[in-house]
């Protein structure tokens, strides 16, 4: 089963930047996580695993990204009240089948304290 | 929690047709549910109360649907091999709260026999 | 429709080189791994090699190393298969095939590979 | 390298037939939970067609007569009732490590 809802904390602040959290079950081999900000494709990370299953990794729109086992991290630094928006982890299943999306998501407020450079 | 895999029959033929299967949670009063044929948007419906706890129906793009306390069906008619694509239900979640988004899909895959008009 | 059509096969002296081409269509060709795998006359299918998606990663089978590469041009939806120092146990139809992530999902028609005096 | 045997190496079959196949590999194919066996069928004079993946999964559109059974090393495809157009050659493949490698084949044949 794979669980639609980001009933985690998708959001880590830190040093004026932001880890968004996108997870994934751990039975999950090969897949597609997407960063969207609104509609738009911010990030993304692709593993997927040859016929003598080398794991490939790739990135169209290149972010600093963090995999494991069960989670991709994509990370946004120098925060400014213009990041503030819905954010959406957009996996694509290619393996174990069959082929699925999930789509999950939050909103990314951005407090005064979390900005990279606060005027004093 | 909010379920986001297609683990169900999301495709069901019956005479030339297509009906596509969107299920959500009972425990969603308010949603938007589209129909998306690969990125495209081929359907969608929207369900709100009003103060008065009345309820509105609405779709800015019009199929033939059925709702029920924890789904959407949307019908597609005359089957021919150009149906053949990845479908996928957005729903759009509203109340309860907090706001979310999960995509499910699935690949429609058109046999000869599920075909409105079949050469004899 | 998933179409993968091979060409380039034909007649080669043994010590000779063949270059093999595998035009795709009907998919996004840079999502997926690709392979080749030949099949000598009246015999079982062999393993050459493969390409992930955009050719940082190949692979090849034992009885081809350093003879055989294998590119692709994403832009041309094209899988390539150049051939040196052929030997006449490398005479065999070659399919190109596409990894569906799981398994070859997809196959070309074969081009037959002749390697002769 | 793995090493796939499979037996036997032909068979003569009438229509209706239940049709056992057997696959061997050298190491077991098993991990996270998978067995990273595959089934293809191929017909004289034609590519391989994929019929099963994980060892048991059948690909969409292939009949259910077709059934992939097994764990570890030791793996079946079984046609439940035999039709005369799955005469041809199957074929075992791992994608356990690499070089993937393919089991020798086996040629059914019409009685």
């Known amino acids: 089963e794979i669980n639609g809802s980001a009933n985690y904390e998708m959001f880590i602040f830190h040093n004026g930047g932001v880890q968004i959290l996108c997870k994934y079950p751990d039975i999950v081999q090969q897949f597609k996580m997407q960063l969207l900000k609104g509609g738009q494709i911010l990030c993304d990370l692709t593993k997927t695993k040859g016929s003598g299953n080398k794991v490939s990794i790739k990135s169209l729109k290149f972010c600093h990204s963090q995999l494991s086992n069960n989670s991709v991290s994509f990370f946004l630094y120098n925060l400014d009240r213009s990041h503030a928006n819905y954010y959406f982890c957009n996996l694509s299943i290619f393996d174990p089948p069959p082929f699925k999306v999930t789509l999950t998501g939050g909103y990314l407020h951005i407090y005064e304290s979390q900005l990279c450079c606060q005027l004093k | 929690e909010i379920n986001g895999s297609a683990n169900y029959e999301m495709f069901i033929f019956h005479n030339g047709g297509v009906q596509i299967l969107c299920k959500y949670p009972d425990i969603v009063q308010q949603f938007k549910m589209q129909l998306l044929k690969g990125g495209q948007i081929l359907c969608d419906l929207t369900k709100t109360k009003g103060s008065g706890n009345k309820v509105s129906i609405k779709s800015l793009k019009f199929c033939h649907s059925q709702l029920s306390n924890n789904s959407v069906s949307f019908f597609l008619y005359n089957l021919d091999r150009s149906h053949a694509n990845y479908y996928f239900c957005n729903l759009s979640i509203f109340d309860p709260p907090p706001f979310k988004v999960t995509l499910t899909g699935g690949y429609l895959h058109i046999y000869e026999s599920q075909l409105c008009c079949q050469l004899k | 429709e998933v179409q993968l059509v091979e060409s380039g096969g034909g007649l080669v002296k043994p010590g000779g080189s063949l270059k093999l081409s595998c035009a795709a269509s009907?998919?996004?060709?840079?999502?997926?791994?690709m392979d080749w795998v030949r099949q000598a006359p009246g015999k079982g299918l062999e393993w050459v090699g493969n390409?992930?998606?955009?050719?940082?990663?190949?692979n090849f089978a034992p009885s081809v190393k350093g003879r055989f590469t294998i590119s692709r041009d994403n832009a041309k939806n094209t899988l390539y298969l150049q051939m040196n120092s052929v030997k006449s146990e490398d005479t065999a139809t070659y399919y190109c095939?596409?990894?569906?992530?799981?398994?070859?999902?997809?196959w070309g028609q074969g081009t037959l590979v002749t390697v002769s005096s | 390298d793995i090493v796939m045997t499979q037996s036997p190496s032909s068979l003569a079959v009438s229509a209706g037939d239940k049709v056992t196949i057997n696959c061997k590999s050298s190491?077991?194919?098993?991990?996270?939970?998978?067995?990273?066996l595959i089934w293809y069928q191929q017909k004289t004079g034609q590519a391989p067609k994929l019929l099963i993946f994980?060892?048991?999964t059948r690909h969409t559109g292939v009949p259910d007569r077709f059934i992939g059974s097994g764990s570890g090393t030791d793996f079946t495809l079984t046609i439940t009732s035999f039709q005369t157009e799955d005469l041809g050659d199957y074929y075992c493949?791992?994608?356990?490590?690499?070089?993937?490698?393919f089991g020798p084949g086996t040629k059914l044949e019409i009685k």
């Open positions: 095939a596409r990894w569906g992530h799981y398994a070859f999902d997809s």
């Open positions: 009907g998919f996004t060709f840079s999502d997926y791994w």
């Open positions: 390409i992930d998606h955009d050719g940082n990663i190949i």
């Open positions: 190491q077991s194919l098993l991990s996270s939970g998978y067995n990273y």
């Open positions: 994980y060892a048991s």
């Open positions: 493949q791992h994608h356990y490590s690499s070089p993937p490698t």
